[in-house]
Structure formats: structure tokens, C-alpha cells
């Protein structure tokens, strides 16, 4: 009896959908695996007789529920199928946006770049897919614990009237208000402000 794959899960970030599993202990030899997806009542092979423990399902439609399954194989024997269901538009993890930060005196000027949909040739981004897409920004004085959050209305934001000659850290994430779903935070970018531009009277 061939044991089934273990810990079967979907690892999906920005619609790059990788089904992953672990090979069970099997004394007779090395196992191979076949992974399939359901397409209108028929299961279609995606990865056949692979020695890998993952399979790329990124071509599946972003919309709708998909049934995926994987089994282990050895010679003419095979395990039972392990099934999972997956809805990319609901389940994919929203990766961190890009961010450009420029210091102008006592202001930080930020521009945000929505994460690209993985593995497509064109420049479609997660913002295209989700109509309610917005950004959350949090910033803080470097070395302090107090963080401030803002929700920019556009793909850019300016933090004004900051303390001069002070290092501020900023990070951004995507947020979907209609789903109450937050993406991953970008790595913090820390920049030092310069002088206060106000002219003494």
C-alpha cells in the first residue's frame, strides 16, 4: 500500500499558485507524484510522475473554486488522492508592494507600486484585479515603538512637517476594504529628513 502525500497545501502569492506536499516515508523506494485539477467534471493532469513535491497551478483562472488533487505512486501502485479546494481571488496572499521614498527637507515623498501578477507577460498588477485596492502606510521614528498609520487615496503620499535631521521608517501594504483583507508589509525603508524649510522672520 502506497501512503498518500502529507501536508498538502496551496502556497499562493500574487496568483502564483504552487501546490506543495511532503513525501511520506516509504521503504520500498522513491515515490513519484501526479497532481491534477478539475476542469468541468474531468480531472486534468498538471504534473505527471514527478519526483518534485510541488506543482505549479498558476494558469488556473483567478476566479472561481478549483479542486486539486495529488497522489503518490510507486511502480504500478498508487496512494489515494488527497484533495484540496482553492479559490485564487479569495485565497492568494497579497505580496508586498514596491515603494520609492525621497526626502525633501522635512518631508518624505512616497510612491507605491502594486505587486505584479506573477508569471504573466504583461504589466497587470494586483490593483487591476481588486477594484477596492488601497494602500496602508505605517511610519515611525527609527528607534521608537509608536507607529502611525495612514491610508493614502492615491499611489503616492507625502509625510510633511516631520522633525528635521530625524530618521523615519516607512512600510506599505495592499489592503482590500471590501474583503477586509490585508497584504504583506513591505520591508521598512528608513530615511533621514534634513532641515526645516521654514524661513525665520
Amino acid at each position: 500500500m502506497v501512503p498518500p502525500p502529507e501536508n498538502v497545501r496551496m502556497n499562493s502569492v500574487n496568483f502564483k499558485n504552487i501546490l506543495q506536499w511532503e513525501s511520506p516515508a516509504f521503504a520500498k523506494g522513491n515515490l513519484t507524484f501526479t497532481a491534477q485539477y478539475l476542469s468541468y467534471r474531468i480531472f486534468q493532469d498538471k504534473c505527471m510522475n514527478t519526483t518534485l513535491t510541488e506543482c505549479d497551478f498558476s494558469s488556473l483562472s483567478k476566479y472561481g473554486d478549483h479542486t486539486l488533487r495529488v497522489r503518490a505512486e510507486f511502480a504500478d501502485e498508487h496512494s489515494d488522492w488527497v484533495n484540496i479546494t482553492f479559490c485564487p481571488v479569495d485565497d492568494t496572499i497579497i505580496g508586498p508592494p514596491g515603494m520609492q521614498v525621497e526626502v525633501l527637507a522635512d518631508s518624505l515623498h512616497m510612491r507605491f507600486l502594486a505587486p505584479k501578477i506573477e508569471n504573466e507577460y504583461e504589466t497587470w498588477t494586483m490593483k487591476n484585479v481588486y477594484n477596492s485596492w488601497t494602500y496602508n502606510v505605517q511610519y515611525w521614528k527609527n528607534g521608537t515603538d509608536e507607529k502611525f498609520q495612514i491610508t493614502p487615496q492615491y499611489d503616492f503620499e507625502v509625510l510633511r512637517n516631520l522633525e528635521p535631521w530625524t530618521t523615519y521608517c516607512v512600510q506599505v501594504r495592499g489592503f482590500l476594504p471590501d474583503r477586509n483583507k490585508a497584504g504583506e508589509w513591505s520591508e521598512p525603508v528608513c530615511e533621514q529628513t534634513t532641515h526645516d524649510e521654514t524661513v525665520p522672520s
Epitope: G64, Y121, W124
Partner: nanobody, 126 residues
Framework: QVQLQESGGGSVQAGGSLRLSCAAS????????MGWFRQAPGKEREGVAF???????RYADSVEGRFTISKDNAKNTLYLQMNSLKPEDTAMYYC????????????????????WGQGTQVTVSS
């Protein structure tokens, strides 16, 4: 939300021609990968012709050289020109779309398209 509406089906003699249309709503039509599928009575739905957002096309072996898929981004419409029709082309024809997609995956399976029309009937008699 994308809405698709097929038209142009009908009855034709073997050897004749038909042109199917699929009107799509949405202002990002140029970003769609699209396809035509068909389902004959008692058979599974099968892919017929596909066009990616970059305009590249693919066909099922059974229709290669007889059918031509195209799309007019200005009119938000997908077409299937069917020539030299055969009785075995008789089926309900459906158009399908996947927004924000490109030619990266050469989509041709039903599970790779998220939006579907209601279908238009094509009947070819001998």
C-alpha cells in the same frame, strides 16, 4: 464583473460558413485571454480556438485551417469565423474570458477561464 454574450449561431449546410460573435462588457477588454469552447449533445465541452491578450492564437486540431479566431478591442467583441463546416461541428458554442492575463500560460482548459457566456447553437446538416 465581466459579462459575455454570444450571437451568430444558426443552421447551415455542410461546407457553409458562420461567424460567431461574443460581446464583452468591461473597459479592460484588451487584457483578456479569450477562447471558444463547444459542447455537442452527450459529449464533454472541448476547446476550439484561443486568443491571448497579445493577439497570439491557438486552435484545436479538428478545426485548424477552417476556423479563425479574432478580436476587436475597440468593439469589445470576440469572433469565430467558421468555414467548411462539417456535421461534426454541430454543438453549442461558448465564449470564455480570463481578465488580466497574457500569453504566459497558453490557456486552453475550461478551468483556466473565469467568465463564460450562455452559448449559441450551431447546427450543420449534411
Amino acid at each position: 464583473q465581466v459579462q459575455l454574450q454570444e450571437s451568430g449561431g444558426g443552421s447551415v449546410q455542410a461546407g457553409g460558413s458562420l461567424r460567431l460573435s461574443c460581446a464583452a462588457s468591461g473597459d479592460t477588454y484588451s487584457s483578456y485571454c479569450m477562447g471558444w469552447f463547444r459542447q455537442a449533445p452527450g459529449k464533454e465541452r472541448e476547446g476550439v480556438a484561443f486568443i491571448d491578450s497579445d493577439g497570439s492564437t491557438r486552435y484545436a486540431d479538428s478545426v485548424e485551417g477552417r476556423f479563425t479566431i479574432s478580436k476587436d478591442n475597440a468593439k469589445n467583441t470576440l469572433y469565430l469565423q467558421m468555414n467548411s463546416l462539417k456535421p461534426e461541428d454541430t454543438a453549442m458554442y461558448y465564449c470564455a474570458a480570463e481578465p488580466y492575463c497574457s500569453g504566459g500560460y497558453h490557456r486552453k482548459e475550461m478551468a483556466e477561464f473565469g467568465y463564460w457566456g450562455q452559448g449559441t447553437q450551431v447546427t450543420v446538416s449534411s
